[in-house]
Interface confidence: medium
């Protein structure tokens, strides 16, 4: 059997962020990142990952939650929440999703 050609990033992912070139991207894995900057509502970005796979293993904090998956369009319907460290009346994970 011939050796299969090596491939670079293979997965097609949903892409929803200011950096997207279109509705999808292709990368080594798919990502969803929920980020809350100081004094702002959380924003959820979907896209592709090629570098820094270690971010996928990070625990959610009150400021960021980083999710990764490895199959076709696997990040399309994923919704994230932030670690709740504030009073229940302010649920940061429910804003902007």
């Amino acid at each position: 059997d011939p050796v299969k050609p090596s491939r670079g990033p293979l997965v097609t992912c949903t892409c929803e962020s200011p950096h997207c070139k279109g509705p999808t991207c292709r990368g080594a894995w798919c990502t969803v990142v929920l980020v809350r900057e100081e004094g702002r509502h959380p924003q959820e970005h979907r896209g592709c990952g090629n570098l820094h796979r270690e971010l996928c293993r990070g625990r959610p904090t009150e400021f960021v939650n980083h999710y990764c998956c490895d199959s076709h369009l696997c990040n399309h319907n994923v919704s994230l929440v932030l670690e709740a460290t504030q009073p229940p009346s302010e649920q940061p994970g429910t804003d902007g999703q």
């Epitope: 011939p2 050609p5 090596s6 491939r7 670079g8 292709r26």
Partner: antibody, heavy 119, light 107 residues
């Protein structure tokens, strides 16, 4: 929007040299595995070769008919892919396309540049 | 080297027709088959990956089937905008090879 724009084609005599360029925009060029594909007049498409991203080693692979004569390179600071063609033969006459994907899938293509090798 | 035999080389269809384009590989390539569409003077467009998966953004009237050596691109309810050159690509082994292409004309 992804754009790939080839340039540098033209008429060259057999045995001559030519360098094609492909200006890329709309995606992270440095992460991309880039390829060249050609189509001779009235013929089917033919894979020429590819170059991996620098983070994946930056190595190249070539089709047998061009190996040793053609060289693929990249300048990530200029978002540009190159195809240096030496010892050109009449059978190298073709439209040359720059493509991007993962090295086996060609997700996006340029519109091509015509290379004519004739005496 | 894997040879891809694509047929027909040319076909004429009427809007609403169902069109099948065949690509046969000279050896088993699993599902490592992609399909592309190219219109005159335009860049080629990636339409089917891994034999059966529609590339996001491509209309669902396009579909792919097959495994091993026999593959088919199907266009259901073909539209006038589907007039183009279609070609297959195998990425199972080097050198990557293409089918000879099919020119689809809409009457």
């Amino acid at each position: 929007e992804v754009q790939l724009v080839e340039s540098g084609g033209g008429l060259v005599k057999p045995g001559g040299s030519l360098r094609l360029s492909c200006a890329a925009s709309g995606f992270t060029f440095s992460n991309a595995w880039m390829s060249w594909v050609r189509q001779a007049p009235g013929k089917g498409l033919e894979w020429v070769g590819r170059i991996k991203s620098k983070t994946d080693g930056g190595t190249t692979d070539y089709a047998a008919p061009v190996k040793g004569r053609f060289t693929i390179s990249r300048d990530d600071s200029k978002n540009t892919l190159y195809l240096q063609m030496n010892s050109l033969k009449t059978e190298d006459t073709a439209v040359y396309y720059c493509t991007t994907g993962d090295g086996t899938h060609f997700d996006y293509w340029g519109q091509g540049t015509l290379v004519t090798v004739s005496s | 080297e894997t040879t891809l035999t694509q047929s027909p080389a040319f076909m004429s269809a009427t809007p609403g027709d169902k069109v099948n384009i065949s690509c046969k590989a000279s050896q088993d390539i699993d599902d490592d088959m992609n399909w592309y569409q190219q219109k005159p003077g335009e860049a080629a467009i990636f339409i089917i990956q891994e034999a059966t998966t529609l590339v996001p953004g491509i209309p669902p009237r396009f579909s792919g089937s097959g495994y091993g050596t026999d593959f088919t691109l199907t266009i259901n309810n073909i539209e006038s905008e589907d007039a183009a050159y279609y070609f297959c690509l195998q990425h199972d082994n080097f050198p990557l090879t293409f089918g000879g292409g099919t020119k689809v004309e809409i009457k």
